[in-house]
């Protein structure tokens, strides 16, 4: 997260880190005791999932292996549409005040809605500085029409944009797959943005979760 702030401890109990060994690979969101939602471009063969801590590499955090993941069947590495994936944990999480599932959306929030995005991604760009603490940024949803002025044909119909006019605050590498939460519901998964990160008036781009609720529910049901 560029130009963000340290999240209030324990305020994001659904936030997970997908680790490759001990290294951050991507963010993710707990949606069920067995399931984590993340970005399809975060796919690996297997994952170490850290839950229940705002500190990356926290020894006291729950760590659960995951060996199965299900990309959206329409995901394209070419056009990066449908950048959404479910990761099935090998064992269920122990829910607590520090570990909770996020609420999936009942509807799509409109432009102008205030949201918070979080992650352990780099706080500087292009040179990288990875924080140990979970970082947050407060952003507002931007209409597709406005966002298309910046990204033109790269912006797909199920992509969502968020940012703050004239501000550098934004997501960056390492934040991928993490949550954009608006009015206590998951509205976006961090997908992509302009590089170097933090260029004012270049919004962050997210997968619009409200458009995928049926796929999420059906995939969890099929593979339970």
């Amino acid at each position: 997260i560029i130009d963000g702030y340290k999240c209030k401890e324990g305020s994001h109990p659904w936030q997970v880190a997908l680790l490759k060994g001990n290294q951050l690979h991507c963010g993710g969101v707990l949606v069920d005791k067995y399931w984590v939602l993340t970005a399809a471009h975060c796919k690996m063969g297997q994952y170490q999932v850290q839950l229940g801590s705002d500190k990356i590499g926290d020894q006291s955090a729950q760590k659960i292996k995951a060996t199965k993941s299900f990309r959206h069947p329409g995901y394209s590495t070419k056009t990066h549409v449908n950048d959404i994936m479910l990761v099935r944990l090998d064992e269920p999480v122990k829910m607590s005040s520090k570990v909770e599932a996020v609420q999936l959306p009942e509807h799509c929030e409109p432009p102008g809605t205030s949201c918070t995005v979080s992650g352990w991604g780099t706080t500087t760009s292009p040179d990288v500085t990875f924080p140990s603490d979970l970082m947050c940024s407060d952003v507002k949803l931007i209409s597709s029409r406005e966002c298309k002025k910046v990204y033109k044909d790269l912006l797909g119909k199920t992509m969502l944009c968020a940012g703050i006019p004239d501000s550098k605050t934004n997501t960056c590498n390492g934040d991928s797959g993490g949550p954009l939460v608006c009015n206590d519901t998951l509205q976006g998964l961090v997908s992509w943005g302009t590089y170097p990160c933090g260029q004012p008036n270049d919004p962050g781009v997210y997968t619009q979760v409200c458009k995928y609720k049926r796929w999420v529910m059906e995939t969890m049901k099929t593979h339970r």
Epitope: H41, M44, V128, N173, G174, G193, Y195, V205
Partner: antibody, heavy 128, light 108 residues
Framework: QLQLQESGPGLVKPSETLSLTCTVS??????????WVWIRQPPGKGLEWIGS???????YYNPSLKSRVTISVDTSKNQFSLKLSSVTAADTAVYYC????????????????????WGKGTTVTVSS | DIQMTQSPSTLSASVGDRVTITCRAS??????LAWYQQKPGKAPKLLIY???SLESGVPSRFSGSGSGTEFTLTISSLQPDDFATYYC??????????FGGGTKVEIK
Amino acid sequence: QLQLQESGPGLVKPSETLSLTCTVSGGSISSSPYNWVWIRQPPGKGLEWIGSILHSGSTYYNPSLKSRVTISVDTSKNQFSLKLSSVTAADTAVYYCARGVPTYWGAASHYYYYMDVWGKGTTVTVSS
Amino acid sequence: DIQMTQSPSTLSASVGDRVTITCRASQSISSWLAWYQQKPGKAPKLLIYKASSLESGVPSRFSGSGSGTEFTLTISSLQPDDFATYYCEQYGSESPLTFGGGTKVEIK
């Protein structure tokens, strides 16, 4: 600072497979969102993009070479490799590896990149 | 594929001259154009990216301009070290990246 070094046989027989490796030093190949790129230059000619790979393993190839090219990455060795099968004399060239700086990060990091750091190049001759 | 046409293919100039090289794309590439300098037996070196952004460490006598289909590289005052071949590269289409045929700047 970041350096790239190509290595591999300088002579390959027609119909065989050309194999080259690029070793990255002074930085990690896992530093997303960079693209790791192969480019070639036949003697006295211009530059041709062969393809690229992200540290995640996603590959992008020149359609004109796609059926013969494989690019792979080994993050543990900080290397990426090129294999070009069924070579002919037309594949004789200086082969360069390079780092591609993208315009976007994340899911779109393979889009729109230019090369800021290049290896010195290695000459590969295809001859029997 | 997007074709890149560079002109001239050879350019004879003297030290101190202002030199302009043109690159045309067969379709619009917005500002996604880079310029490279290559000396004999050496790898290309990045000079300009995003049509007009100067790469760090590159002398300010090099400048780039243009957008859409027409681009130029200008050397405001040619120095002895600038005699080389220059290539443009378009990176404004998803695949493949393509280069111009090159412009050789030689001593008059």
